[in-house]
């Protein structure tokens, strides 16, 4: 089948890094600068991605593979293949449409991206609080109160408001 196909379509012989040039009797021509073909048999080469502005080059474009971008310091990748760069916030903050905002009381964010999340309510999982939560850290749950030996104590956290009142995100 492959042999038959190549007789019918000379373009199928063109390897990655080349394209089948209709203007030159379907000869396999190398991809021009700043373009690539990652598979054989292509009739055109694709334009290389350019990592500009907040994007920086993680891998240079070659004749057979596209460039890969990541983000400059202070930003992180979002989307497939780092299609966007989003501003970092500090731990204990979340990125809203108005910029980085501190987590409200009763919520935390232990990363430079994402939202502020409510502290875990240990009692709902039948456990007690071992370590209080902060803006940067969730509470740490321990054994259930019944598992604690007499005289042992667990930290009682301040009760977070049911509606912590996130800044809009």
């Amino acid at each position: 089948f492959e042999r038959t196909r190549s007789l019918q379509d000379p373009c199928s012989n063109c390897p990655a890094g080349t394209f089948c040039d209709n203007n030159r009797n379907q000869i396999c021509s190398p991809c021009p600068p700043n373009s690539f073909s990652s598979a054989g048999g292509q009739r055109t080469c694709d334009i290389c991605r350019q990592c500009k502005g907040v994007f920086r080059t993680r891998k240079e474009c070659s004749s057979t593979s596209n460039a890969e971008c990541d983000c400059t310091p202070g930003f992180h990748c979002l989307g497939a293949g780092c299609s966007m760069c989003e501003q970092d916030c500090k731990q204990g903050q979340e990125l809203t449409k108005k910029g980085c905002k501190d987590c409200c009381f009763g919520t935390f964010n232990d990363q430079k991206r994402g939202i502020c999340r409510p502290w875990t309510n240990c009692s709902l999982d039948g456990k007690s609080v071992l370590v209080n939560g902060t803006k940067e850290r969730d509470v740490v749950c321990g054994p259930s109160p019944a598992d604690l030996s007499p005289g042992a104590s667990s930290v009682t956290p301040p009760a977070p408001a049911r509606e912590p009142g996130h800044s809009p995100q």
Partner: antibody
């Protein structure tokens, strides 16, 4: 390619409990939150809660607090959702779903769903 | 608690543009995600952070969000787009879904 594979259909009596599992096969980076969402027959999607597989931290929808428990077994790359005191209104397809890398509640991968039927 | 309102159904002819709305108080200040669900299947994320598309989702799908309304727009509608569509936001410790919109391709 990461896939979420859930346990099979269950039939339960009112008042009983059900525990549904969700195994991540393929590459699943650490720290991706796992959510549980249910859908009653002919109805919309209803969020139940999440677990942070890295820490075990949870958050539950107010409606289910006291009846739902979400746990995980990191060594088996599996999350579990247990719902107790079942009633007929809990008949639904239960989905696990992975939150995406931006950690902004976008659910970018879903299990195939587990039908739980509650009937006397 | 926060509520999201979607029209129960939207009908559109093939090749035309479908617009599905999701209403909520000051929803423009929130990040909205959209899911497509075909009968008997799990939902699929089609738009996230208001207007971004996951890989594999056609460019025909786009989103916008301002004021009290977020909108999912599907241009050049195809028969295969017939499905239920749900919007979703995060509000004060809870994930909230809209009631869903059934898109019918005439």
């Amino acid at each position: 390619q990461m896939q979420l594979v859930q346990s099979g259909a269950e039939v339960k009596k009112p008042g009983a409990s059900v525990k549904v599992s969700c195994k991540a096969s393929g590459y699943m980076p650490d720290g991706y939150y796992m959510h549980w969402v249910r859908q009653a027959p002919g109805q919309g999607l209803e969020w139940m809660g999440w677990i942070n597989p890295r820490t075990g931290g949870t958050n539950y929808a107010q409606k289910f607090q006291g009846r739902v428990t979400i746990t995980r077994d990191t060594s088996a790359s599996t999350a579990y959702m247990e719902l107790s005191s079942l009633r007929s209104e809990d008949t639904a397809v239960y989905y696990c779903a992975r939150e995406g890398a931006a950690f902004r509640l976008e659910l970018d991968a879903w299990g195939q769903g587990t039908l739980v039927t509650v009937s006397s | 608690s926060y509520e999201l309102t979607q029209p129960p159904s939207v009908s559109v002819a093939p090749g035309k543009t479908a617009r599905i709305t999701c209403g909520g108080n000051n929803i423009g200040s929130k990040s909205v995600h959209w899911y497509q669900q075909k009968p008997g299947q799990a939902p699929v994320l089609v738009i996230y952070y208001d207007s971004d598309r996951p890989s594999g989702i056609p460019e025909r799908f786009s989103g916008s969000n301002s004021g009290n309304t977020a909108t999912l727009t599907i241009s050049r509608v195809e028969a295969g787009d017939e499905a239920d569509y749900y919007c979703q936001v995060w509000d004060s410790s809870s994930v909230v879904f809209g009631g869903g919109t059934q898109l019918t391709v005439l």
